[in-house]
């Protein structure tokens, strides 16, 4: 055949020969020769190799330290890390998920967009005209002001981002 | 063009003692590993034996292991088989055979030396 | 070691013909380390594949070969006058590297 410029696919050059990498999951004992083929062996327990490799050590599983809030959501195998996520009310700080912190409140004036998840913290919205947000909450939208019409009242205390629409009785007209 | 040129068959007794070598041209030897591959009149081809391209590793089949004895000179571009203890089943053309690039396949041949073992 | 089992022994076809041969291992060959050699009549074998499906150097495109673990095939899609002769895999995943014992292609 053609001298090759570069081995085939799941292939590594070592030696003048091209030698099979280990599957998932193993980790290689020894490089192929002119006359044996690659030696792997599979990973141990809590260990993993997620690719075709050549590599002589697998890597350790993802431990979820409980102590910073974490839990696992996926048990590694021994192809995949472990995957950890947050306790409830707590979310990742980090795409790798290293460590967690509480989710954060929206404050007064603010709302709700959208809650948080194990992975993204709280995403927060000024209270548009017309509604208002009078507690600090991880979970509140905001709520529209009261309409007094409909209760045959009238506002007697214009309503803030803060505060809700105060509504008093209709002044009578005396005939 | 690679060549290579098997030498030093014959009639031999059953007992005895043979040398066979293998001439090598059209190639740089020393970067291929090399082999030794026989084949019965009328039957199958069997895997003798085979060598590194340095000499370091050398690998047998059971059927001539302890008997047979493959080496290597590089400076000669030679590659040779000494055969003790000669049995009549050893009887065979022998094949030597280089490497093809980078794989564990045998892609040249030399035409063959017979040995005959017999009394 | 590893055994090699061919079949058929002997598989009987015109030229135009599709030819399948079949090569089984007692035990997984690792990584697809597998050849297929042709040997004719007086000569030496000739190399056709390599590591089970790559074709050697100046093999025509009609030879073919597949498979993985313990079940390999070599396959000649249309026989040429010149395709008749004896097959056999080798296998070199680990010394002792074995052979299996033949499949004759005949002309019917």
């Known amino acids: 055949p053609e001298p090759p410029t570069a081995c085939r696919e799941k292939q590594y050059l070592i030696n003048s020969q091209c030698c099979s990498l280990c599957q998932p999951g193993q980790k290689l004992v020894s490089d192929c020769t002119e006359f044996t083929e690659t030696e792997c062996l599979p990973c141990g327990e809590s260990e993993f190799l997620d690719t075709w490799n050549r590599e002589t050590h697998c890597h350790q599983h993802k431990y979820c330290d409980p102590n910073l809030g974490l839990r696992v959501q996926q048990k590694g195998t021994s192809e995949t890390d472990t995957i950890c996520t947050c306790e409830e009310g707590w979310h990742c700080t980090s795409e790798a998920c290293e460590s967690c912190v509480l989710h954060r409140s929206c404050s007064p004036g603010f709302g709700v967009k959208q809650i948080a998840t194990g992975v993204s913290d709280t995403i927060c919205e000024p209270c548009p005209v017309g509604f208002f947000s009078n507690v600090s909450s991880a979970f509140e939208k905001c709520h529209p002001w009261t309409s007094c019409e409909t209760k045959d009242l009238v506002v007697q205390q214009a309503g803030t981002n803060k505060t809700d629409v105060v509504c008093g009785p209709q002044d009578r007209l005396r005939a | 063009e690679v060549q290579l040129l098997e030498s030093g068959g014959g009639l031999v007794q059953p007992g005895g003692s043979l040398r066979l070598s293998c001439a090598a041209s059209g190639f740089t030897f020393s970067d291929y590993a090399m082999n030794w591959v026989r084949q019965a009149p009328g039957k199958g081809l069997e895997w003798v034996s085979g060598?590194?391209?340095?000499?370091?590793?050398?690998y047998y089949a059971d059927s001539v292991k302890g008997r047979f004895t493959i080496s290597r000179d590089n400076s000669k571009n030679t590659l040779y088989l000494q055969m003790n203890s000669l049995r009549a089943e050893d009887t065979a053309v022998y094949y030597c055979a280089k490497h093809v690039d980078f794989y564990r396949a045998l892609d040249y041949w030399g035409q063959g030396t017979l040995v005959t073992v017999s009394s | 070691e590893i055994v090699l089992t061919q079949s058929p022994g002997t598989l009987s076809l015109s030229p135009g013909e599709r030819a399948t041969l079949s090569c089984r291992a007692s035990q997984s060959v690792k990584n697809s380390s597998l050849a297929w050699y042709q040997q004719k009549p007086g000569q030496a074998p000739r190399l056709l594949i390599y590591?089970?499906?790559s074709r050697a150097t100046g093999i025509p495109d009609r030879f073919s070969g597949s498979g993985s673990g313990t079940d390999f095939t070599l396959t000649i899609s249309r026989l040429e006058p010149e395709d008749f002769a004896v097959y056999y895999c080798?296998?070199?995943?680990?010394?002792?590297?074995?052979f299996g014992q033949g499949t004759k292609v005949e002309i019917k």
């Open positions: 060598i590194k391209s340095g000499g370091s590793s050398k």
């Open positions: 080798q296998q070199s995943s680990a010394p002792p590297w074995t």
């Open positions: 590591t089970a499906s």
